[in-house]
């Protein structure tokens, strides 16, 4: 008789999840010599231990602490790039500007990027059929709690000028319900962070509006200012040219506004 299994609203665990995490861990240590002390088998065990045999709606930050410890990493605190709803461009940017880091440029972010995972209460099985959806099922699911935990730690580590890339094509350029809006903004440390600089990325070629005047950006400025952190904002009118100029800053066309 097949065992009854909870049906969740979200997609199930990414196929070959354990192998993917292990392979990514090894790949990361290959690229980043400073992380070669990392024991990828222990990393997988700690990752697995955070959600296996636990109810996937009852995961806590505490469950991830062994993994957090194994993945402890020092990134230059003044070279942090946060992003919201514009991951691909943020990653393209840090691939060119190698001294800046998104969360997914750290070991733990790299391991979990674009993956889904969950287990089942009281069994050692990984659920490949379905996992809880943040809205439709529960917020304390393995994936959401993981990103909340690593995002909080990443924001807490930031100092000096912190940059955030925001998607100017969205109806809410700054969304209080995003990970940036609900976690990272509130965990920047005013005693360490002097300024949050927002880069609003324009979508349309002919879009010459000053999106720094958008009401949601003003809301972000208000939240940040109340936390005793300065705020500044820049429009990135042409993201393609922006990336090109990061690659080749000497290019004569890069002196004009991008």
């Amino acid at each position: 008789v097949p065992r009854w299994r909870q049906q969740w609203s979200g997609p199930g665990t990414t196929k070959r999840f354990p192998e993917t995490v292990l392979a990514r861990c090894v790949k990361y240590t290959e690229i980043h010599p400073e992380m070669r002390h990392v024991d990828c088998q222990s990393v997988w065990d700690a990752f697995k231990g955070a959600f296996i045999s636990k109810h996937p709606c009852n995961i806590t930050e505490e469950d991830y602490q062994p993994l957090m410890k194994l993945g402890t990493q020092t990134v230059p605190c003044n070279k942090i790039l946060l992003w919201s709803r514009i991951k691909d461009l943020a990653h393209q940017f840090t691939q060119v500007q190698r001294d800046m880091f998104t969360l997914e440029d750290t070991l733990l972010g790299y391991l979990a990027d674009d993956l889904t995972w969950c287990g089942e209460f009281n069994t050692s099985k990984i659920n490949y059929q379905s996992c809880p959806d943040w809205r439709k099922d529960c917020s304390n699911n393995p994936v959401s709690v993981f990103w909340k935990t690593v995002s909080r730690r990443f924001a807490e580590a930031a100092c000096d000028v912190v940059h955030v890339m925001l998607n100017g094509s969205r109806s809410k350029i700054f969304d209080k319900n995003s990970t940036f809006g609900s976690v990272e903004v509130h965990n920047l440390q005013p005693e360490k962070v002097q300024t949050l600089e927002a880069w609003v990325i324009h979508g349309g070629r002919e879009d010459s509006r000053d999106l720094c005047q958008d009401p949601t950006i003003k809301e972000l400025e208000s939240i940040i200012s109340k936390r005793n952190i300065q705020f500044s904002c820049k429009n990135i009118y042409r993201p393609d040219k922006f990336l090109q100029c990061v690659k080749n800053p000497e290019d004569s066309s890069c002196t004009s506004e991008i």
Epitope: V26, T29, H37, Q41, A46
Partner: antibody, heavy 121, light 107 residues
Framework: QVTLKESGPTLVKPTQTLTLTCTFS??????????VGWIRQPPGKALEWLAH???????RYNPALKSRLTITKDTSKNQVVLTMTNMDPVDTATYYC?????????????WGQGTLVTVSS | DIQMTQSPSSLSASVGDRVTITCRAS??????VAWFQQKPGKAPKLLIY???YRYTGVPSRFSGSGSGTDFTLTISSLQPEDFATYYC?????????FGQGTKVEIK
């Protein structure tokens, strides 16, 4: 099959520099993810990790001995060389080289047979 | 540096006995502990890594467990070829450090 073999002097005088060579087969340090480390063991005592080197020339040393140690590799000869300056009788030990592999952090899975180095005047 | 303390330093046992060796780390090393077997005049042989993973070719009578600071190597049924010295090693951080060894002798 991976094999490693240590070679070098069996006797060195105090204050001299020790040069040890690890020659290996079935392993290439031009292959991503591979490394070779050195460990020593004084007679009747425990093991002590000294240093290791990765395929991309990334090196790590035991901080307590760092000022005296240099590790290098010659990929074409399949060799790793450890030099240790200012030898002292307390450095008398069997010196081993061993393989390390990325992802298992610093787990040494294949070891050489070891070479006994005596420091005495 | 992380100190690795093994106990006992030596033990006497008979063939067929269940033998347990413990290792305590001076700080949390999660599960980054390896165990080695060494016979006189020979190089150490890897038995267990990452606390509980048996290395290729190691007999199933050898098992490892533990996490955090306390780790155990168990030989479920001691064989004549198992009389040797056993070392634990933390592979969590540099400098890599070893325990002082546990000598398993014939009773």
């Amino acid at each position: 099959q991976v094999t490693l073999k240590e070679s070098g002097p069996t006797l060195v005088k105090p204050t001299q520099t020790l040069t040890l060579t690890c020659t290996f087969s079935g392993l290439s340090l031009s292959t991503s993810g591979k490394g070779v480390g050195w460990i020593r063991q004084p007679p009747g005592k425990a093991l002590e990790w000294l240093a290791h080197i990765w395929w991309d020339d990334d090196k790590r040393y035991n901080p307590a001995l760092k000022s005296r140690l240099t590790i290098t590799k010659d990929t074409s000869k399949n060799q790793v060389v450890l030099t240790m300056t200012n030898m002292d009788p307390v450095d008398t030990a069997t010196y081993y080289c061993a393989r390390i592999e990325l992802g298992r952090s610093y787990v040494m899975d294949y070891w050489g047979q070891g070479t006994l180095v005596t420091v005495s005047s | 540096d992380i100190q690795m303390t093994q106990s006992p330093s030596s033990l006497s046992a008979s063939v067929g006995d269940r033998v347990t060796i413990t290792c305590r780390a001076s700080q949390d090393v999660i599960t980054s502990v390896a165990w080695f077997q060494q016979k006189p005049g020979k190089a150490p042989k890897l038995l267990i890594y990452s606390a509980s993973y048996r290395y290729t070719g190691v007999p199933s009578r050898f098992s490892g467990s533990g996490s955090g600071t306390d780790f155990t190597l168990t030989i479920s049924s001691l064989q004549p070829e198992d009389f040797a010295t056993y070392y634990c090693q933390q592979h969590y951080t540099i400098p890599l450090t070893f325990g002082q060894g546990t000598k398993v002798e014939i009773k």
